[in-house]
């Protein structure tokens, strides 16, 4: 769920995810739309389809609640849980890694991006 | 190979707590990813999931029961334990332990069942 | 919480004859598991991850299905296939089973 994923991107990334990427750009945080602003966003972006597709397999992606481990700078998702439990965190691992990979493109002028300024087709999943 | 066995009290009556063992070999619960379910049938009926302890001690419950279940075990001794407190009638049952082993959603191994009775 | 409703709850079938076991869920589930018991013993595992049989089990066995509806099959039926046999999801927490489908031989 929510606090699982916080608690990941925290720990991989380093950065605060309230105060980082809740939101940033057209897709970090709720919803989303229009073209990404960069490949932070891009990230934002792919998790949203991740979770989209969980959804169509009937998973509660917001209250599922599942294991993993993180060590030396790795994240292990638990083999415990539910099918839905374990996709949801493999969702989430991927989007922290995704948001580490680009810490150094990050754009601080992209933080509470003002929505209605997200244009373009919106890329399908 | 893998067994498991249950044992149990037989009978017991209404409101008392309701203490089940499950003795297993072939397998360590000390073994990363391991674990063992209890799930009960009652007499003619269908199949119902109690609970679930896992290698490392974390423990999962049936919702509809959890604040009468608790789950535990002894790694050293290859055992599993489930209390059920203030049983009633509706607890009586064939009770199994159930083997989950690795990223297994289902349960590949099964005890024979020890059968409680609960008396009025 | 994931219900899961067989049918038929009871059967019969002739030797030889084709036999379908429906198992309905009542939202999307990834696998479905079947197990297969017979009276006085313990279930066993029948068939994982929708169609794979488990060790043992016959040929004229089959799984199928996806989304919210799966079903356990037997080409030809024979006498010791007379059982009951449960459906099981462990797709969202916590896992559950069916009522079970009571198959006879006639």
């Known amino acids: 769920g929510i606090l699982n994923l916080n608690k990941m991107v925290k720990q991989v990334t380093g950065k605060m995810p309230i105060l980082s990427y809740w939101p940033y750009g057209c897709h970090c945080g709720l919803g989303g739309r229009g073209q990404p602003k960069d490949a932070t966003d891009w990230c934002c972006q792919t998790h949203d389809c991740c979770y989209d597709h969980l959804k169509t397999q009937g998973c509660s992606i917001y209250k599922d609640y599942y294991r993993y481990n993180f060590s030396q700078g790795n994240i292990h998702c638990s083999d415990k849980g539910s099918w839905c439990e374990q996709q949801l965190c493999a969702c989430d691992k991927e989007v922290a890694f995704c948001l580490k990979r680009n810490l150094d493109t990050y754009q601080k002028r992209l933080r509470f991006y003002w929505r209605p300024h997200c244009r373009g087709q919106t890329p399908g999943c | 190979q893998v067994t498991l066995k249950e044992s149990g009290p037989g009978i017991l009556q209404s409101s008392q707590t309701l203490s089940l063992t499950c003795s297993f070999s072939?397998?360590?619960?000390?073994?990363?990813?391991?674990?063992v379910s209890w799930i009960r049938q009652p007499s003619g009926k269908g199949l119902e999931w109690l609970a679930h302890?896992?290698?490392?001690?974390?423990?999962r419950y049936n919702p509809s029961l959890k604040s009468r279940l608790t789950i535990s075990k002894d790694t050293s001794r290859n055992q599993v334990f489930l209390k059920i407190s203030n049983v009633d009638t509706a607890d009586a049952a064939t009770y199994y332990c159930?083997?989950?082993?690795?990223?297994?959603?289902?349960?590949?191994?099964w005890g024979t069942g020890t059968t409680v009775t609960v008396s009025s | 919480q994931i219900v899961l409703t067989q049918s038929p709850a009871i059967m019969s079938a002739s030797p030889g004859e084709k036999v379908t076991i429906s198992c309905s869920a009542s939202?999307?589930?990834?696998?479905m598991y079947w197990y297969q018991q017979k009276p006085g013993s313990s279930p066993k595992p029948w068939i994982y991850r929708t169609s794979n049989l488990a060790s043992g089990v016959p040929a004229r066995f089959s799984g199928s299905g996806s989304g919210t509806s799966y079903s356990l099959t037997i080409s030809s039926m024979e006498a010791e296939d007379a059982a009951t046999y449960y459906c099981?999801?462990?797709?969202?927490?916590?896992?559950?089973f069916g009522g079970g489908t009571k198959l006879e031989i006639k």
């Open positions: 939202s999307s589930v990834s696998y």
């Open positions: 072939g397998f360590s619960l000390s073994t990363s990813s391991m674990g």
């Open positions: 099981q999801q462990y797709h969202t927490y916590p896992p559950t």
């Open positions: 302890i896992y290698w490392d001690d974390d423990k």
């Open positions: 159930a083997r989950r082993a690795g990223n297994f959603f289902y349960f590949d191994v």
